[in-house]
């Protein structure tokens, strides 16, 4: 199988004329050392080819999980989930773009995009590296988390005396602690503006507004629809 034939991610599927958004199974790749993986592909947004790595929409799946679960992934690919840091690391080994889509409780949708996205390996605590921000989600609320290691309730890699993962109730690239908390606690309407550990993006709605819906998705930088 040549590299042109290989299916690595949703952009590979798109190039092979799979154009319907939904669940796909990526085959294992012995050369890359990647196992078979079920993914959700967004084949519509801004040309398609996006591999969804996180979704918050129903609030039924708790994201207050341990290191092992964030490494392997949890939740349902059809619902709320985290794809898994190991999978995200593999998917971002080529130059990759990140898109974050957010919806508030008033139904307004905003997005943030990053020209470059790398998730380092476990040895480097799945450290986040980001390129330039663009979008309409207000101030860049991931910049503060750039070049920051991933932390969970059982592995404190943040830059703070506080244990940010325990404080903000999630797994994330905590600094000291947050300008955003996309893996925070899902709060429903009525509770959504009362807490600091919710699903926040400070650059849009501030520190204590928990969003209704979030999706994080990636695709190769050189993707051409």
């Amino acid at each position: 199988q040549t590299s042109a034939d290989a299916i690595y991610d949703c952009s590979s599927l798109y190039q092979k004329n799979y154009r319907i958004s939904g669940v796909y199974r990526l085959p294992s790749n012995d050369f890359l050392g990647s196992p078979e993986l079920e993914v959700f592909c967004d084949m519509e947004t801004k040309g398609g080819g996006w591999t969804v790595i996180q979704r918050r929409k129903s609030g039924l799946v708790s994201f207050y999980r341990d290191w092992k679960q964030y490494k392997q992934g949890f939740g349902s690919i059809r619902g709320d989930f985290w794809l898994g840091n190991e999978h995200i690391h593999r998917l971002s080994r080529q130059p990759t773009r990140l898109r974050v889509e957010m919806e508030d409780w008033e139904g307004t949708v905003r997005y943030a995009e990053y020209s470059h996205f790398v998730l380092s390996n476990e040895l480097n605590s799945y450290r986040l590296f980001l390129g330039n921000y663009s979008g309409n989600a207000g101030n860049d609320a991931l910049y503060y988390h750039n070049n920051t290691a991933f932390s969970t309730k059982d592995k404190d890699n943040d830059n703070c005396l506080d244990k940010c993962a325990q404080l903000r109730k999630g797994g994330y690239w905590y600094n000291c602690c947050t300008d955003s908390n996309l893996n925070g606690v899902y709060y429903r309407l009525g509770e959504h503006d009362k807490h600091l550990d919710g699903i926040t993006w400070y650059g849009w709605h501030g520190a204590n507004y928990s969003l209704k819906r979030v999706e994080m998705k990636i695709r190769p930088e050189d993707f051409k629809p």
């Epitope: 609030g59 392997q72 949890f74 690919i77 059809r78 619902g79």
Partner: antibody
Framework: QITLKESGPTLVKPTQTLTLTCTFS??????????VGWIRQPPGKALEWLAL???????QYSPSLKSRLTITKDTSKNQVVLTMTNMDPMDTATYYC????????????WGQGTLVTVSS | DIQMTQSPSSLSASVGDRVTITCRAS??????LNWYQQKPGKAPKLLIY???SLQSGVPSRFSGSGSGTDFILTISSLQPEDFATYYC?????????FGGGTKLEIK
Amino acid sequence: QITLKESGPTLVKPTQTLTLTCTFSGFSLSTSGVGVGWIRQPPGKALEWLALIYWNDDKQYSPSLKSRLTITKDTSKNQVVLTMTNMDPMDTATYYCAHNPDYGDFFDYWGQGTLVTVSS
Amino acid sequence: DIQMTQSPSSLSASVGDRVTITCRASQSISSYLNWYQQKPGKAPKLLIYAASSLQSGVPSRFSGSGSGTDFILTISSLQPEDFATYYCQQSFSTPLTFGGGTKLEIK
């Protein structure tokens, strides 16, 4: 429809190892998000969660029992096995296995339960 | 670990009564709270998940409310088949934990 059934010994001696098998139908343990859990209930007492295994082989254990518990799955056989070492009379209980749906960590379908008595 | 405390531990009521059972978490768990019903010699049955979502097939006289640390299970009009033990369970963080149970008996 989803069904689960526990099987294993009804009587074990102290210090022995208990092996319980949960055989299920109506769902696949290779479906994203799905899990199977074990919960026990001593006679006349409350429910106690023991362990949970997910579709991706992630395993979660009760911290107080973690050193004694092992949970495994055989997706092709539709089975989940729980082993518990160094059994004690205090472990006498009805042991249930239950289906954890793909949309949350709770149990929407349960087996009938199997009563395990620990006695010499 | 998150402790779940139910009250009362037992309750006597009559058919047709409105009954409430409370469950309190030792820390905030948002809406990650589930309710089960168990009859003697039987396995538990899921009634409510995510604090207020009614499980398929469960009669509408059962309802759940609350968020954070305090939760309530309400049975609007008790039926003879509702006399059982009720348990709450948090699914916010492992270890998953259950309340001590509330036994609902006929007055």
